[in-house]
Amino acid sequence: AGVFELQIHSFGPGPGPGAPRSPCSARGPCRLFFRVCLKPGLSEEAAESPCALGAALSARGPVYTEQPEAPAPDLPLPNGLLQVPFRDAWPGTFSLIIETWREELGDQIGGPAWSLLARVTRRRRLAAGGPWARDIQRAGAWELRFSYRARCELPAVGTACTRLCRPRSAPSRCGPGLRPCAPLEDECEAPPVCRAGCSLEHGFCEQPGECRCLEGWTGPLCMVPVSTSSCLGLRGPSSTTTGCLVPGPGPCDGNPCANGGSCSETPGSFECTCPRGFYGLRCEVSGVTCADGPCFNGGLCVGGADPDSAYICHCPPGFQGSNCEKRVDRCSLQPCRNGGLCLDLGHALRCRCRAGFAGPRCEHDLDDCAGRACANGGTCVEGGGAHRCSCALGFGGRNCRERADPCAARPCAHGGRCYAHFSGLVCACAPGYMGARCEFPVHPDGVSALPAAPPGLRPGDPQRAGVIAVIVVVVIAIVAGIVVLVISRKKRMAKYEKAEIKEMGEMHRELNA
């Protein structure tokens, strides 16, 4: 038994252009937390295993708020170590999966929203009881710096925490009823002494006098990073004389990387860059499986159908993202029309409508006309949530209650006299003029300049009474039409008001649930 310990030193934008300024979205402040998952790295059964060695979740880091125009600082991180206890032997070779999560603290209905910022997956060799191993990993535009170690918990000792030890003073046999604790050492042993000068940071040993290097380091004392080797770029078997590599077939020939991984050459070897969900030397191991519970917010995890994904998350209502980590801001799509207030209840969306509107998305315009009908034969016109009256001639104002003087604007031309009438106005034209507004001059021979135009009505014209009779019939027809329209509107509004009362009751119940 023992404990794997992970210390995050820094998480922030990586070097180079296009690096993000802030981990937070535009919606406001956020804070970071980390998840670590450990898997044994050699056995074939690890391919579909959960975090078999254990997993841990860090505390939340301090709240981070981006300062506009300020240089991006080191992001505030959670305090303390991430500790993953392991019950059995430490496997030595293992896979380390570190996820950096962002918790958004903006005004989220239903609580904070999480999103996965970065995931690094590395296969590592590490002896228990050794020094801290440091690492820097890139994940997209982010860079993560961390240290890790595995340590045994007494009485377990050794590089795999499999040997048990006891102090000299302890009795040499197990107590009555207990089976032997083999292999039991005579005393607590010190870890093996490595070769003199072996790097404490990048080397370790399982036998006294040896110096074995962690991944990324080479040389007899594990002091040389592999990327600075003078033989970089050369291929083939090792030369015994120079220690350099001589040309030969490329390690990436035939692409040894499985599951769509891409191969890049390293001195004398190769490295696979694996697609999401896979890891291992050849991307042959599925990194995160459904048994790890990768779907947040209760999402249903299903084994991926295509080779590029180890799993697919089917999200609960109100969540999205490859891990169901994003709360769906469905109100940002402005589904409520006519100024309605959008409420995202998590599992459903509700619109609280402004007065005069109804329907699931406030799409029905009740327009208030029925409640405040237009007077004096005015017609109500719907639109924009505010009713508008188109008034009959001779009336004006918001509800057509004010009597208008149609002659106030002096509409009769060429000295014609204006008479206000319930159906509008009538111009009595001066001699020599004709037309509805006395706009046409009459020629000396009695022919109008526009013979098609009807003559203006003068007081005493025999046509006048007939025209007025026609107008009266038209007005009566309009008034009758308005009465029918108002009655039908009242019925329709009553129906929607009933529906709206029911909907508001439901909404109140849901919000209180």
Epitope: L57, G111, N297, G298, G299, L300, C301, H314, P316, H347
Partner: antibody, heavy 117, light 107 residues
């Protein structure tokens, strides 16, 4: 292989208490929402309650029929979720299952609770 | 709570026949419907999620369809091991609710 194993069921008198346990293996337990669902004899399924994750402050939700009487808790270090049932009624007689997630993907084999005088 | 009504209550069929089970919701639940199979003395098992998606390891003879308020589970050709009780469940509105079940028995 994912396994959920319920225990703690038995015969209890009305008004009595019982504590059910559900031990999980084969999954990273701390990442899963856990639910209790029950099935009265010869009847259908009824959701009882749910507990979420540490990152959700172990939020719990309950069916109206058990609210105030039943309490769900979890111990991630032991891969175990519990259902504490108090003030039991005869209508609580059922097989109790623990299930995972929002969609009840993994199920235990169930434990029988009989409330009778 | 949303009420799910399953029909028929019992379906008597022979192996090899096609089974069609219905589930109606009291209100719109989108496609947030799952189907579960329960054999005597066993726990329920998830078959279909999201109205029409087969869960991991479920044979292709099981298919689901529908959206809104009307949903159907179809077993294209009944195998002896398919005779069981089938429940629909809605996951659109919290709390989740189940239908009363349809028993598929051997004729």
């Amino acid at each position: 292989e994912v396994q959920l194993v319920e225990s703690g069921g038995g015969l209890v008198k009305p008004g009595g208490s019982l504590r059910l346990s559900c031990a999980a293996s084969g999954i990273t337990f701390s990442n899963f929402w856990m639910n209790w669902v029950r099935q009265a004899p010869g009847k259908g399924l009824e959701w009882v309650g749910q507990i979420r994750l540490k990152s959700d402050d172990y939020a719990t939700h309950y069916a109206e029929s058990v609210k105030g009487r039943f309490t769900i808790s979890r111990e991630d270090s032991k891969n175990t979720v519990y259902l504490q049932m108090n003030s039991l009624k005869t209508e609580d007689t059922a097989v109790y299952y623990c299930t995972t997630g929002y969609y009840f993907d993994y199920w235990g084999q169930g434990t029988t609770v009989t409330v009778s005088s | 709570n949303i009420v799910l009504t399953q029909s028929p209550a019992t379906l008597s069929l022979s192996p090899g026949e096609r089974a069609t089970l219905s589930c109606k919701a009291s209100e719109n639940v989108g496609t947030y419907v799952s189907w579960f199979q329960q054999k005597p003395g066993q726990s329920p098992r998830l078959l279909i999620y999201g109205a029409s998606n087969r869960y991991t390891g479920i044979p292709a003879r099981f298919s689901g369809s529908g959206s809104g308020t009307d949903f159907t589970l179809t077993i294209s050709s009944l195998e002896p091991e398919d005779f069981a009780v089938y429940y629909c469940g809605q996951f659109y509105s919290f709390p989740s609710t189940f239908g009363g079940g349809t028993k598929v028995e051997i004729k």
